[in-house]
């Protein structure tokens, strides 16, 4: 990515060209990174301490997992050194619909650069994928999945709506939240939105641009719920069982709509991270602002993706992009400041620990180690056939 003057907007610290922030570690290893996953958890509830201990046992990661209240399932990580870090958040994908054969709605990625102090506590909720409508262990539902049973289509034909045989929409994907605590109040750094759940019915894919918020004075509301649940936002409240919960309320995924559960137990719950539960329409994705679900139970209405967020304390390094096909992730790395390089890209030589600038294709690094110049073309050689003739 080409991103010039990266720290211009950073209110915390101005970095002089070629300088990285003070380090507590004598040797900076740019290859070190910390990858946070769902620890094997899936569905509407987050991981336990035991799951994360097991998942990270052969890695450089050690986390404490919240066990009760709104922090249940949230991974708490202590920053190892004062430094500038890149934090990549990836929201989870929404669930597939029963007859919706297109790919699931991908979770959003957001990458930001932040200055963090040694022993800062980062709170990390890794979003979990919304549940798929198919396949199902329930024979009755599986017959719908494979096209042997058309009770939904029949009800639509007769009533022009779905009520008795509701269900078959995917659950909304959970958002991935990275935040700090200030005086006991969560302060968001990055929120990567979850994808909306797909509706039961197949239809042409509609393009919705990724939405990104960077103003924390904007209210972090839940998405609107209909028969399916809206996605959970940052700090809203809901009493609806099928709505995704906001981070403030624990960010659990919503249940399937009551109609679907009551008739045939078609369970398509939203993912942890505020995914809304599915009905015949899809559940909304979690986010800073949750994604809306259809106001009725339209079996062709996908749930909306949530809205992503980046704190003004950080710098957005890449635009929000829909990339995640499954559960979310968080990847934290030491950030190497390359703003002195002509193309803002560099790497650290692992032996000399010197910063070496990159150049675009067709150019080479000048002697100043910063500028890029057009590579000098060598003298053209005559073809061997001409020399021999």
């Amino acid at each position: 990515p080409k991103s010039r003057n990266l720290f211009e907007r950073n209110p915390n610290k101005e970095l002089k060209p070629g300088e990285n922030s003070p380090r507590q570690t004598p040797i900076f290893d740019p290859t070190v990174h910390w990858l946070f996953t769902t620890c094997g958890a899936s569905g509407p509830h987050g991981p336990t301490q035991a799951q994360c201990n097991n998942a990270y046992q052969n890695s450089n990661l050690s986390v404490e997992v919240g066990s009760e209240g709104p922090l249940k399932g949230i991974q708490i990580w202590k920053v190892p050194a004062t430094d500038t870090y890149s934090i990549s958040g990836y929201g989870a994908a929404g669930g597939k619909g029963g007859k919706n054969t297109m790919m699931r709605s991908h979770g959003v990625s957001v990458l930001g650069i932040f200055n963090l102090e040694k022993d800062d506590m980062l709170y990390i909720l890794v979003g979990q994928q919304g549940e798929d409508a198919c396949p199902s262990t329930n024979q009755l539902i599986q017959k719908v999945c494979i096209g042997e049973n058309n009770v939904i289509e029949e009800e639509i034909r007769v009533n022009r709506s779905v009520h008795e045989w509701a269900g078959g929409g995917g659950g909304g994907g959970g958002a991935t939240y990275v935040f700090k605590m200030k005086d006991g109040v969560p302060v968001p750094l990055i929120i990567a939105a979850g994808g909306g759940g797909r509706a039961y019915g197949a239809k042409t894919d509609t393009f919705h641009p990724e939405r990104l918020e960077n103003n924390s004075s904007v209210l972090g509301l839940n998405g609107n719920s209909g028969a399916a649940g809206g996605g959970g936002g940052w700090n809203d409240n809901t009493s609806l069982l099928w709505a995704g919960k906001s981070l403030q309320e624990g960010a659990t995924g919503g249940h399937s709509c009551p109609q679907a559960m009551k008739k045939w137990g078609w369970e398509t719950r939203g993912g942890f991270g505020g995914g809304g539960g599915g009905c015949s329409s899809g559940g909304g994705g979690g986010g800073y602002i949750g994604g809306n679900a259809a106001s009725n139970n339209d079996p062709e209405m996908d749930g909306e993706d949530g809205v992503s967020f980046i704190s003004p304390l950080g710098i957005l390094y890449t635009p929000a992009l829909k990339v995640m096909e499954g559960h979310g992730e968080v990847n934290i790395k030491h950030y190497l400041n390359c703003s002195h390089c002509e193309v803002d890209e560099c790497h650290m030589d692992p032996e000399s620990h010197k910063v070496i600038c990159f150049c675009d294709h067709g150019t080479v690094l000048a002697e100043d180690g910063v500028s890029c110049i057009v590579s000098p073309t060598p003298e053209p050689h005559l073809p061997l056939s001409l020399i021999l003739s």
Epitope: Q139, L140, V151, H255, P258, M261, K262, K263, W264, G265
Partner: antibody, heavy 120, light 111 residues
Framework: QVQLQQSGAELVKPGASVKISCKAS????????MNWVKQRPGKGLEWIGQ????????TYNGKFKGKATLTADKSSSTVYMQLNSLTSEDSAVYFC?????????????WGQGTTLTVSS | DVQMIQTPDSLAVSLGQRATISCRAS??????????MHWYQQKPGQSPKLLIY???NLESGIPARFSGSGSRTDFTLTINPVETDDVATYYC?????????FGGGTKLEIK
């Protein structure tokens, strides 16, 4: 693990009412129908009715309409069955039973039963 | 209501032999290509326990010597081979139509 814990045995007089309870644990209480089934000594099983705790929706066997009233308390994950105008015919063991896969499913977990004796 | 007739009322089988219990519904209990017929076991002084759901599916944790078959109105529960632990009363139940109804039960004893 799923558990259904019923209240203890009851001895009541004819004409009175009784309310028996069934506390559920180990699953999403609001998302599954809870049923009640009657078994008289040495007799078969009779379905009384069901309640969906998520929204309080109820369905009754016509034979028990006016006899049984089902309620649910989501905060305590407990369902209740009130039986009124009791007669000796109501002396039986009553089971609460979870429906799995909605009302088109099957009874997968049963409470231990509550013995009701109606006698003067 | 759908009537469920179980036969026989009682059955005595030698250990290691096959026990067969029949259940006949007064009308078809099939719908959407599925039989809404289930079998339960009740041991003396205990609650009923699910054995077979939707005619032929073995509930998790139930030994494979239990099996179910049939469709529409005629269904069979088979226990082969019978063990002492199988002494109980067995009930069939339909829920294709409300109200759900049970058979009268078949009491299995060891000969």
């Amino acid at each position: 693990q799923v558990q259904l814990q019923q209240s203890g045995a009851e001895l009541v007089k004819p004409g009175a009412s009784v309310k028996i309870s069934c506390k559920a644990s180990g699953y999403a209480f609001s998302s599954y129908w809870m049923n009640w089934v009657k078994q008289r000594p040495g007799k078969g099983l009779e379905w009384i009715g069901q309640i969906y705790p998520g929204d309080g929706d109820t369905t009754y066997n016509g034979k028990f309409k006016g006899k049984a009233t089902l309620t649910a308390d989501k905060s305590s994950s407990t369902v209740y069955m009130q039986l009124n105008s009791l007669t000796s015919e109501d002396s039986a063991v009553y089971f609460c039973v979870r429906y799995y896969y909605g009302s088109s499913g099957y009874f997968d977990y049963w409470g231990q039963g509550t013995t009701l004796t109606v006698s003067s | 209501d759908v009537q469920m007739i179980q036969t026989p009322d009682s059955l005595a089988v030698s250990l290691g032999q096959r026990a067969t219990i029949s259940c006949r519904a007064s009308e078809s209990v099939d719908n959407y290509g599925i039989s809404f017929m289930h079998w339960y076991q009740q041991k003396p002084g205990q609650s009923p326990k699910l054995l077979i759901y939707r005619a032929s599916n073995l509930e998790s944790g139930i030994p494979a010597r239990f099996s179910g078959s049939g469709s529409r109105t005629d269904f069979t529960l088979t226990i082969n081979p019978v063990e002492t632990d199988d002494v109980a009363t067995y009930y069939c139940q339909q829920n294709n139509k409300d109200p759900p109804t049970f058979g009268g039960g078949t009491k299995l004893e060891i000969k």
